[in-house]
Amino acid sequence: SIPWNLERITPPRYRADEYQPPDGGSLVEVYLLDTSIQSDHREIEGRVMVTDFENVPEEDGTRFHRQASKCDSHGTHLAGVVSGRDAGVAKGASMRSLRVLNCQGKGTVSGTLIGLEFIRKSQLVQPVGPLVVLLPLAGGYSRVLNAACQRLARAGVVLVTAAGNFRDDACLYSPASAPEVITVGATNAQDQPVTLGTLGTNFGRCVDLFAPGEDIIGASSDCSTCFVSQSGTSQAAAHVAGIAAMMLSAEPELTLAELRQRLIHFSAKDVINEAWFPEDQRVLTPNLVAALPPSTHGAGWQLFCRTVWSAHSGPTRMATAVARCAPDEELLSCSSFSRSGKRRGERMEAQGGKLVCRAHNAFGGEGVYAIARCCLLPQANCSVHTAPPAEASMGTRVHCHQQGHVLTGCSSHWEVEDLGTHKPPVLRPRGQPNQCVGHREASIHASCCHAPGLECKVKEHGIPAPQEQVTVACEEGWTLTGCSALPGTSHVLGAYAVDNTCVVRSRDVSTTGSTSEGAVTAVAICCRSRHLAQASQELQ
Amino acid sequence: QEDEDGDYEELVLALRSEEDGLAEAPEHGTTATFHRCAKDPWRLPGTYVVVLKEETHLSQSERTARRLQAQAARRGYLTKILHVFHGLLPGFLVKMSGDLLELALKLPHVDYIEEDSSVFAQ
């Protein structure tokens, strides 16, 4: 029977008695930076080339005995998870191993850096097909390690790393905190976050997605035919490295941004029990479990978007938080969120020739998050149109006036501290979907984009009575690009996108009480690209 | 994910640039910074990654490393260049006393210095 973890990542159409998806990652090379490995294990024999790279610290303790099977344990198991004959994800992928962890599973930032440099030099000397680098390790936050990962990613390499096994915010660890790296948390057979001893998987906004990482059967270095169960975010990352190899083998031209968006898109959504995570981290942690795409081709027609949360701004009065998209992505909308509800909104602004999403804290606020909606939109030309605070009682409005530009998102930003406390709601006039509406004291920012075949529509869901959460989702075939709250309520904490659903959060109803100001309206902007759909059909 | 400039307070020690013997002063107004792991048991003091500014060539990296060694020797300190980086990041890995950090931060082309630290299998 198929091991639970392989079944979990396999779409139903592949599920037979044996896990045999097409293509197997044969066009892709996966680099593994880990312990030494037992390359003659039946699972990985002939699939893994052991490089001569070794940079490890000495083992701790005078009583440590180097036992070959222990030294090879971690790396052998992971190589098996990625490409093992019986229990591997991408059975066709070839691998190269670099030893950066000693027999106790310990390495150094400097050794890892030199290993990454070795990979880059190998890539320059002998360019091959797509490269995936698996980093099943973690240390404390490291600016230099994150920078090296960024450089390698910008050279076209896909880096996949473990979120860490510290039951903590992954942003406090490297390379997990590097934005360019695909960071993977671990879940178990019940789709619960993995507990390991007193700790467990890391979580938070620096995690891209989760994957099976508990009780994973794979190659054991105890003997050439042995298997063993291992657990951790390394095992989860190995699954994603295998899935990435499969995807890149099917579509070798995929960029890192495209691959990440596809990994997110094809993941199982909302299956993780978020109660395991600390309350303040639940909204930041993606509820996604990695899976292979149901078919290796034909995903190109989709408009892919993801949500990127900023770091917390901190509580000072003028504090701001910035969320950025990857270089190949377009920022299509920007929203903000504050647990205290005290914020001064958000705006899209240019920084280094690229749009970023900036959220503003308010006096007495505990801090804000900026939330960027980052999308893949080829040949896009996007700009931000701003309307300053209006004098008229009807509020501030801004629309996309350029020919062929459509509205993808609305933001509003204000200087006064208590905006909306005693103001009646402002309703959007019907028949004007290309328009953002806000309070008269607020600046309103419209994200307007032109791209071949791009069409968007506005969808609203209003609830007259106060409620902690109001949602509105885009229907099948449409992708959520913008998420905001219609102005007029004092207790809105903010808005953010979760997959294809726009979520508007309000203060706990029990504390605000039911008033005439209780109405909450969530506004979603849903887009699709006819151009991408046509291009996909022409390819097929 | 984490912003490049590191929103997380991994200890950052900025030391003001001052003329120091034969060292060229860094470009006006820029201050190299020192970073170390926030988790104390994972720190590896005595080994440092000196990261140079983005467009620094390999020859300049080697020259900067040699300059650090020469200035350290004048002060009676032994240093060892363990690796010169090029291809991904310009810079070098050096084994030296933490006493020399102030000196190293004033070297030309230095962007930041990070103390080495441990990583672990997950």
Epitope: S1, P3, S69, K70, S73, H74, D86, Q104, G105, K106, N165, T195, L196, G197, L199, E214, D215, I216, I217, S220, D222, C223, T225, C226, F227, V228, S229, Q230, S231, G232, S234 | P41, W42, S118, F120, A121, Q122
Partner: antibody
Framework: EVQLVESGGGLVQPGGSLRLSCAAS????????MSWVRQAPGKGLEWVAN????????YYVDSVKGRFTISRDIAKNSLYLQMNSLRAEDTAVYYC???????????????????????WGQGTTVTVSS | DIQMTQSPSTLSASVGDRVTITCRAS??????LAWYQQKPGKAPKLLIY???SLESGVPSRFSGSGSGTEFTLTISSLQPDDFATYYC?????????FGQGTKLEIK
């Protein structure tokens, strides 16, 4: 689905020997520690011995040390318990069980996380009597 | 060796009752404790591992708690199928010991 089937039980005189076997079906047999547990008539459960995946580590309850030997044959997907110098107090139903557990790493190195005995055989009866 | 003591030895209860079985270790075992259910003539069945984690396929009316030396197994609402003998088991560096068992019978 993993299945465990014990055999080899029977009546034996005090001082005699017996070899119990446990045949496993399902490929995960070789991936886990395995245990023998016994239950004397009308009494509770008593753990007897366990063995690591590759047979390199074995542990025993004090009362059987030096008399019983646990072993496994990965190629045959089988677990064994060689019982020598049998005593009347060894009379029991003997179960083989899979020890579900997993290895994981922390900054301290390699750790073992034990879940419990999640798959059991139906048991084989050993009677030691003259 | 670590001794495990279960209480009570026998427990009479009715369908729908909430019942609690206690297990005490002679020294701290952290959370390394499992609970099993055994019916006459059958092999034991794993219910709870690591003190509080529910084994896959086990009904949610079973729950475990505790750490160190004191542990409890709770059945929130007894069902007819739950009348059986329950054992706790500690794990400590690859050697195990069971409690003497608690027989749960119909009142």
């Amino acid at each position: 689905e993993v299945q465990l089937v014990e055999s080899g039980g029977g009546l034996v005189q005090p001082g005699g020997s017996l070899r119990l076997s446990c045949a496993a079906s399902g490929i995960t047999f070789s991936s886990y520690w395995m245990s023998w547990v016994r239950q004397a008539p009308g009494k509770g459960l008593e753990w007897v011995a366990n063995i690591k995946q590759d047979g390199s580590e074995k542990y025993y309850v004090d009362s059987v040390k030096g008399r019983f030997t646990i072993s496994r044959d990965i190629a045959k997907n089988s677990l064994y318990l060689q019982m020598n110098s049998l005593r009347a107090e060894d009379t029991a139903v003997y179960y083989c069980a899979r020890d579900r557990g997993t290895y994981y790493y922390t900054e301290g190195g390699y750790n073992y996380y034990y879940y419990g005995m999640d798959v059991w055989g139906q048991g084989t009866t050993v009677t030691v009597s003259s | 060796d670590i001794q495990m003591t279960q209480s009570p030895s026998t427990l009479s209860a009715s369908v729908g009752d909430r019942v609690t079985i206690t297990c005490r270790a002679s020294q701290s075992i952290s959370s390394w404790l499992a609970w099993y259910q055994q019916k006459p003539g059958k092999a034991p069945k794993l219910l709870i591992y690591k003190a509080s984690s529910l084994e896959s396929g086990v009904p949610s009316r079973f729950s475990g708690s505790g750490s160190g030396t004191e542990f409890t197994l709770t059945i929130s609402s007894l069902q007819p199928d739950d009348f059986a003998t329950y054992y706790c088991q500690q794990y400590n560096s690859y050697s195990y010991t069971f409690g003497q068992g608690t027989k749960l019978e119909i009142k």
